[in-house]
Amino acid sequence: YNNFRKSMDSIGKKQYQVQHGSCSYTFLLPEMDNCRSSSSPYVSNAVQRDAPLEYDDSVQRLQVLENIMENNTQWLMKLENYIQDNMKKEMVEIQQNAVQNQTAVMIEIGTNLLNQTAEQTRKLTDVEAQVLNQTTRLELQLLEHSLSTNKLEKQILDQTSEINKLQDKNSFLEKKVLAMEDKHIIQLQSIKEEKDQLQVLVSKQNSIIEELEKKIVTATVNNSVLQKQQHDLMETVNNLLTMMSTSNSAKDPTVAKEEQISFRDCAEVFKSGHTTNGIYTLTFPNSTEEIKAYCDMEAGGGGWTIIQRREDGSVDFQRTWKEYKVGFGNPSGEYWLGNEFVSQLTNQQRYVLKIHLKDWEGNEAYSLYEHFYLSSEELNYRIHLKGLTGTAGKISSISQPGNDFSTKDGDNDKCICKCSQMLTGGWWFDACGPSNLNGMYYPQRQNTNKFNGIKWYYWKGSGYSLKATTMMIRPADF
């Protein structure tokens, strides 16, 4: 017993409470009538008195004590029985309680187990659903993979067939290339043969040219001889005339003028009686320096000195400053007479300039300037023009006022560019201006939309390259 308590209840019964662990037991005991209560006047220590008592009194007391002892024993036995009875009852109660408690616990555990089982079942269901979902997803993925695999297989097959096709094509092309190579080799051989033949031809032509040159030299010599003979004849004629005038001096006092042999321009040649078109030797003013020029003795009354001609593209007009200064080309064909001679000539007296033009459609036109001259080289042979008439445009295609002359190596134009290089040829470029009769020569059907052709804007417009041009001068008083 851990704890033992004793108390009195309200009806006088004694209570005994026993605490054992978590269990508490209460015993109700009946109070004995023949037993003296603890509050009786009997004093327990009377036995211990020193004064001797009388015998009867002692026997009586002993009997009382015996009775008390017997009562106590009976009481204890009763108590024991009572306790045993109560204990049995309690034990039965305890057992019943225990069974009830265990049942409750069992029920609780069962309930818990059921709850847990339900929970587990739910979880299992969830897991099962998840597994199903996962399985479905995997099945779908598997299906997709199989589909993509099929697709890839198909693509691979397609690509394989494509590769086979390409290989076939490649082999075909290789064959073609080889065939072309063979053809190329054959062509090269034939070209080589042609080249050899051409070389032979060229060497033949060279020998012919040499012969011709020799003939030309001979002809020139003959020409010189003829000219000398002509000169001698003229001198003889002059002498004869002098003699005649001397013999007739009494009758006719007029003395014949000496025949003029050197000519400044074609007008002088014409006036001297030479009225046939051709090349004539002209002399620089105030100089013995000579220059060959073509004289037009038929057009517009004749006496025209040709200073420029374009007709077939046989001469390159993209020349240097010096070449334009002294002249180049062939007077019977395409040529430039020379800026220095023209400058000197036109500063001696007043000259007119006529520009004659031909297009590719068979049309002809001209521009006539009633006053023309070129400044000196120091002033870059600047052109001066006045009084335009003619059929090649009412506005001058040579920019007014006149510009300096420019060549590929002498840029004197008013452009941020170099007109002579851009448009080709030497000309009185502005920036770059409405004309350039020394541009590139373009053949028919290739002569439009040209940036560097033979241009005379106010007759044929922009980009039109002309077929033929002639620039000619003549004294204004001719």
């Epitope: 941020i416 920036a431 040209k450 940036f451």
Partner: nanobody, 129 residues
Framework: DVQLVESGGGLVQPGGSLRLSCAAS????????IGWFRQAPGKEREGVSS????????YYADSVKGRFTISSDNSKNTVYLQMNSLRPEDTAVYYC??????????????????????WGQGTLVTVSS
């Protein structure tokens, strides 16, 4: 061979819009200036707008300023003329023409008509209700 081909012309009502194209071949726009010109019946050819690709400069005649826009696409070698708020007086044959970009007089920005050496055949624009 240098060639310019115009397209995009047609009949349009006053206030309407048209976009003309000028396709160039035989040269690249980088080194050239392209101009749009127009010629009305019985009138002289006049400059409308020009573009120079090497410096991105553009020019507009006073009569078209604020209404017309010139642009170029070098990848297509083509120049465009966007014409908005069209008027009856804009009726004409429209030509595009090319000039080497460097062919400029000192101190000047644009080119006289005679410097444009390559021309297209033209496209007719009619503004009428």
């Amino acid at each position: 061979d240098v060639q310019l081909v115009e397209s995009g012309g047609g009949l349009v009502q006053p206030g309407g819009s048209l976009r003309l194209s000028c396709a160039a071949s035989g040269f690249t726009l980088d080194d050239y200036a392209i101009g749009w010109f127009r010629q009305a019946p019985g009138k002289e050819r006049e400059g409308v707008s020009s573009i120079r690709d090497n410096d991105g400069s553009t020019y507009y005649a006073d009569s078209v300023k604020g209404r017309f826009t010139i642009s170029s696409d070098n990848s297509k070698n083509t120049v465009y003329l966007q014409m908005n708020s069209l008027r009856p007086e804009d009726t004409a044959v429209y030509y595009c023409a090319a000039v080497p970009a460097g062919r400029l007089r000192f101190g000047e920005q644009w080119y006289p008509l005679y410097e444009y050496d390559a021309w297209g055949q033209g496209t007719l624009v009619t503004v009428s209700s």
